[in-house]
């Protein structure tokens, strides 16, 4: 029961996390204009991974997509890649975990197969969460660097008369959504991995050692520790979960991973 709850909760937490990662990736407010010196602006700038926007005091909002690929900073491209990889891995993880849920019966799928699938999805969630956290953190670091650089040369004067005030950007809502979502996906993945341990049938398939006292000589029946070696006959043909290693009669098919980036 606890295993089912842990697995179910892990799935739900991961689902929320991945939804959050998708939301963060699509959001326009990755960086927002710093309003520290001027809390009320006529023109409010904010930027996302895919476009930058302006909200005017008139109430109108206009966005412009980044219609170039080569002209974009390498860091931005890297963040995009990390977020997309995170989403793809998370989506595949969700797909795998649906079939791995203990509460869902699919044909005669055995617990060991479900355990393996749970572990697989758990690892995928962990990597997905890490990708999102890494992506958001890289972007945040980029913002901090640019913030202090633009603060250092806040005004570039033209003969003292004309001032070009650089727009400083600070953390946008998407960063916090991304961090929280990445954390949730990570936690969900860990929960799935924990659940996978409980799903595996923990039976130690030891065979009894028979002692035949024939005089003073002691004879040991051969094949005494067959289960632990993985060789020899396994009469009940039970699959033994050993943290990912599989016995030879166990055929495990993993879904193929396609990264559509």
């Amino acid at each position: 029961m606890a295993v089912t709850a842990c697995q179910g909760l892990g799935f739900v937490v991961s689902l929320i996390g991945i939804a959050g990662i998708i939301a963060a990736t699509c959001m326009d407010q990755w960086s927002t204009q710093d309003l520290y010196n001027n809390p009320v602006t006529a023109v409010f700038n904010y930027q996302g991974l895919w476009r930058s926007c302006v909200r005017e005091s008139s109430g109108f909002t206009e966005c412009r997509g980044y219609f170039t690929l080569l002209g974009l900073p390498a860091m931005l491209q890297a963040v995009r890649a990390l977020m997309i990889v995170g989403i793809v891995l998370g989506a595949i993880g969700l797909l795998v975990s649906i079939f791995a849920l203990k509460c869902i019966r699919i044909g005669s799928m055995e617990d060991s197969a479900k355990a393996n699938m749970t572990l697989t999805s758990g690892i995928m969630f962990i990597v997905s969460g890490l990708c999102a956290i890494a992506g958001v953190s890289v972007f945040a670091n980029m913002l901090v660097t640019n913030f202090w650089m633009s603060t250092a040369n806040m005004y570039t004067g033209m003969g003292g008369m004309v001032q070009t005030v650089q727009t400083r950007y600070t953390f946008g809502a998407a960063l916090f959504v991304g961090w929280v979502a990445g954390g949730l996906t990570l936690i969900g993945g860990v929960m799935m991995c924990i659940a996978c341990r409980g799903l595996a049938p923990e039976e130690t398939n030891y065979k009894a050692v028979s002692y035949h006292a024939s005089g003073h000589s002691v004879a040991y029946k051969p094949g005494g520790f067959k289960a632990s070696t993985g060789f020899g006959s396994n009469t009940k043909n039970k699959k033994i979960y050993d943290g990912g290693a599989r016995t030879e009669d166990e055929v495990q098919s993993y879904p193929s991973k396609h990264d559509y980036v």
């Epitope: 602006t41 700038n45 008139s58 966005c63």
Partner: antibody, heavy 118, light 113 residues
Framework: QVQLQQPGAELVRPGTSVKLSCKAS????????VNWVKQRPGQGLEWIGM????????RLNQQFKDKATLTVDKSSNTAYMQLNRPTSEDSAVYYC???????????WGQGTTLIVSS | DIVMTQSPSSLTVTAGEKVTLNCLSS????????????LTWYQQKPGQPPKLLIY???TRDSGVPDRFTGGGSGVDFTLTIYRVQAEDLAFYYC?????????FGSGTKLEMK
């Protein structure tokens, strides 16, 4: 069509507060900011401030913060500007205007000529 | 506050010629988010309220003849009137829409010879 109607003139004694009106029609009043602009005879234009009819939010030029109070009456689609303790310096034409994209003022009232005289 | 400087203060022209009015801002009016310049041009005839001609530095308002063209970026802007007509004689003002308080230039008076 969009219209901003203002009374032609107001005569007021120095020190007596006056409330100028601007009645909007032909558009959704609560969707656009209403600006107030001052123009003294033979002078340029001076932005006083703006008010948003939906929540009565205001943005005021600091030079007018003690002089002007901007309000709206949604029921009558009217924006108001109250000028406190007017002096001869406040004698001018006061325009109300709607804010458009680019923070530009696309529709203007005909203006109210305020005469401050004893 | 952003200071808007217009030049010349007055200009005498003959019908049919091309006229260029200048507006200099003390600060860049370019918004990084949409790469638009928040500069507006108005025309004001005597006894009338100002009329919107151009916003976003180069976007003509509806109903404005195409002989009016806005240009420039950052701090330096121009309003060009091709083939000036008698009805174009008026005051022309530029306005900063980039930051509060919105500020206007002192205006350029267009006169006929």
């Amino acid at each position: 069509q969009v219209q901003l109607q203002q009374p032609g003139a107001e005569l007021v004694r120095p020190g007596t507060s006056v409330k100028l009106s601007c009645k909007a029609s032909g558009y959704s009043f609560t969707n656009y900011w209403v600006n107030w602009v001052k123009q003294r005879p033979g002078q340029g234009l001076e932005w006083i401030g703006m008010v948003h009819p939906s929540g009565s939010e205001t943005r005021l030029n600091q030079q007018f913060k003690d002089k002007a109070t901007l309000t709206v009456d949604k029921s009558s689609n009217t924006a108001y500007m109250q000028l406190n303790r007017p002096t001869s310096e406040d004698s001018a034409v006061y325009y109300c205007a709607r804010v458009w994209s680019g923070n530009a003022f696309d529709y203007w009232g005909q203006g109210t000529t305020l005469i401050v005289s004893s | 506050d952003i200071v808007m400087t217009q030049s010349p203060s007055s200009l005498t022209v003959t019908a049919g010629e091309k006229v260029t009015l200048n507006c200099l801002s003390s600060q860049s009016l370019l918004a990084s988010g949409n790469q638009r310049n928040y500069l507006t041009w108005y025309q004001q005839k005597p006894g009338q309220p100002p009329k919107l001609l151009i916003y976003w530095a180069s976007t003509r308002d509806s109903g404005v003849p195409d002989r009016f063209t806005g240009g420039g970026s950052g701090v330096d802007f121009t309003l060009t009137i091709y083939r000036v007509q008698a009805e174009d004689l008026a005051f022309y003002y530029c306005q900063n829409g980039f930051s509060f308080p919105f500020t206007f230039g002192s205006g350029t008076k267009l006169e006929m010879k």
